[in-house]
Amino acid sequence: ILWHEMWHEGLEEASRLYFGERNVKGMFEVLEPLHAMMERGPQTLKETSFNQAYGRDLMEAQEWCRKYMKSGNVKDLTQAWDLYYHVFRRISKHHHHHH
């Protein structure tokens, strides 16, 4: 499966868990393997392109999630969601225009 599809599906599920279920732990469990995949690095040209477009924002979002896990401060989680939100919108629009 392509990275943009994995992130699109993963962020949708993370959103459902957080906003619908109020399950922060479940949200992190969905996002952690996706971040781990990014940390392993791109293997194809499409993955390289995805990493260039979204890698920095996703890494920053992961940092805010880690801060939240230590602090419990919802402001840190909001910063993470702000980044995920913008990545998701860009992925959605790009995916929509090419399919």
């Epitope: 962020l11 459902r16 906003f19 969601w81």
Partner: antibody
């Protein structure tokens, strides 16, 4: 067509109980999220409680915590708000609403609302 | 709790006017803000979700925007059916909170 229909409102004395119902149709109730929002006469909107129909996960406003209980019966496509130890300040129109997300965005909003049911707490 | 401070609390306008209602969150809520319209004796109706996305079936004269923690609902050309009360609401943190409402009245 998506529909939410509340019932169960009425006049109740302080300290009394009431159970509101929210009958849902036109969508997959099992995988939905239902919220109760109230509006005191001449006032604004106040969020009360929420439930995930599938998991049963719930949240409450501090003002009703310990007194109100939200539940859902997926076999009847109905959500409930059990209200105990009612106070005069609970007097309001109570609305149930579906909480949903949309394509292109991760964020959620209440896209369908019932017509509301009036709860009056008075002696 | 996150406070959503709406202004003005009421305004008078004429048909055809451009109307702007603002909502300020007490802390960051990202773009997790919706706007609702409510007419007397009726349930609220969703107009805008995610700060700037127009809900299905809502006329294009309605628009929403975000600047940091400030959110704006704009009606580009007020129509007779738009006289109502408008509420903002944040959904990123519980408890979900609404603004106190803005009543749009006929001048």
């Amino acid at each position: 067509e998506v529909q939410l229909v509340e019932s169960g409102g009425g006049l109740v004395q302080p300290g009394g109980s009431l159970r509101l119902s929210c009958a849902a149709s036109g969508f997959n109730f099992y995988s939905s999220y239902i919220h109760w929002v109230r509006q005191a006469p001449g006032k604004g909107l106040e969020w009360v409680a929420s439930i995930s129909s599938s998991s049963g996960s719930t949240s409450y406003a501090d003002s009703v915590k310990g007194r109100f209980t939200i539940s859902a019966d997926t076999s009847k496509n109905t959500a409930y708000l059990q209200m105990n130890s009612l106070r005069a300040e609970d007097t309001a129109v109570y609305y149930c609403a579906r909480f949903s997300s949309y394509y292109y965005t991760l964020y959620w909003a209440m896209d369908y609302w019932g017509q509301g049911t009036l709860v009056t707490v008075s002696s | 709790d996150i406070q959503m401070t709406q202004s003005p609390s009421s305004l008078s306008a004429s048909v055809g006017d451009r109307v702007t209602i603002t909502c300020r969150a007490s802390q960051s809520v990202s773009s997790a803000v919706a706007w609702y319209q409510q007419k007397p004796g009726k349930a609220p109706k969703l107009l805008i979700y995610s700060a700037s996305s127009l809900y299905s079936g809502v006329p294009s004269r309605f628009s929403g925007s975000r600047s940091g923690t400030d959110f704006t609902l704009t009606i580009s050309s007020l129509q007779p059916e738009d006289f109502a009360t408008y509420y903002c609401q944040q959904s990123i943190h519980y408890p979900l909170t609404f603004g106190q409402g803005t009543k749009v009245e006929i001048k």
